[in-house]
């Protein structure tokens, strides 16, 4: 058993429970954003394909003194499997582009709710 | 002590649209995630969907084109719409609570029956 | 979608009897499978939850065991309030899905 959704999660869970908390995590985030979040910081986009989640991780790691998306750093950590640190960079990251934090959360969202709905929760 | 309370029509016609309502009670419907089940004559249970506690929905994609559930936060409600119904969709109908980071029900509503017929 | 499959259908037992169901998943479920029970005309209750973790109130004459792809719901000496219909489900991934249920007569 893998305790899917990191340090979020109450212990072990099925992935698709995992997901789902994800995705409410990243709706919540979406739906109370008042100010710029994270006051507009930037972050490397991602290829949103095998792998993506330690991508996000890493891309999102990077961010600090940003209580808004410190949940979804935590929850993401579950579905990697090694252990990311700031600065660490995979393929997976388009290099050449940085978009806000806002726009990587809303780009992540649909995507994951697209995975969701197709039934890929692994 | 949370409770659950489904009502609506008993019938309805065919390619009609079935609309029913779960009141909830004790507990806020801004909390955990509602879901609609339902049990045709003879048939297993059948999961339809969700809506969270921010209002987001998954839907079973064998109902995908037929169903939307909603929510009225200042009546603690959810519904169910059931477009262009036929006789496949008599069922005994119910609303269930399934907390977050949970995957089983703990909270169901007695259920109603819906009969689809002209 | 994962297909859950109870047996038997039905089974006629006394008081004080041991009974057993088993529910079969058509994959690996791992240990995400729920039991619950429902009596005529009433909403259904759920009794465990994890393949073998009792329900809050849950008498411990039920328990559940199994993983992977089969599972078990024992009732170690049947009380005249278990005559009812039992379910399992999977939490495995959504949509989630039901067995046919397990009505459980008086001989």
């Known amino acids: 058993l893998t305790c899917l959704g990191g340090f979020a999660s109450p212990g072990p869970v099925p992935p698709s429970t995992a997901l789902r908390e994800l995705i409410e995590e990243l709706v919540n985030i979406t739906q109370n954003q008042k100010a710029p979040l994270c006051n507009g910081s930037m972050v490397w986009s991602i290829n949103l394909t095998a792998g993506m989640y330690c991508a996000a991780l890493e891309s999102l790691i990077n961010v600090s003194g940003c209580s808004a998306i410190e949940k979804t750093q935590r929850m993401l950590s579950g579905f990697c499997p090694h252990k990311v640190s700031a600065g660490q960079f995979s393929s997976l990251h388009v290099r050449d582009t940085k978009i806000e934090v806002a726009q990587f959360v809303k780009d992540l969202l649909l995507h994951l709710k697209k995975l969701f709905r197709e039934g890929q929760f692994n | 002590e949370v409770q659950l309370q489904e009502s609506g029509p008993g019938l309805v016609k065919p390619s009609e649209t079935l609309s029913l309502t779960c009141t909830v009670s004790g507990g806020s419907i801004t909390s955990d995630y509602w879901n609609w089940i339902r049990k045709p004559p003879g048939k297993k249970l059948e999961y339809m969907g969700y809506i969270s506690y921010n209002g987001n929905t998954y839907y079973n994609p064998s109902l995908k084109s037929q169903i939307t559930i909603s929510r009225d936060t200042s009546k603690n409600q959810l519904s169910l719409k059931l477009s262009s119904v036929t006789a496949a969709d008599t069922a005994v109908y119910y609303c269930?609570?399934?907390?977050?980071?949970?995957?089983?029900?703990?909270?169901w509503g007695q259920g109603t029956t819906v009969t689809v017929s002209s | 979608d994962i297909q859950m499959t109870q047996s038997p259908s039905s089974l006629s037992a006394s008081v004080g009897d041991r009974v057993t169901i088993t529910c079969h998943a058509s994959q690996n479920i791992n240990v995400w499978l729920s039991w619950y029970q429902q009596k005529p005309g009433k909403a259904p209750k759920l009794l465990i939850y994890k393949a073998s973790d009792l329900h809050t109130g849950v008498p411990s004459r039920f328990s559940g065991s199994g993983s992977g792809t089969d599972f078990t719901l024992t009732i170690s000496s049947l009380q005249p309030e278990d005559f009812a219909t039992y379910y399992c489900q999977q939490g495995q991934s959504y949509p989630y899905t039901f067995g046919g249920g397990t009505k459980v007569e008086i001989k």
């Open positions: 269930a609570r399934l907390a977050k980071w949970t995957w089983y029900f703990d909270i």
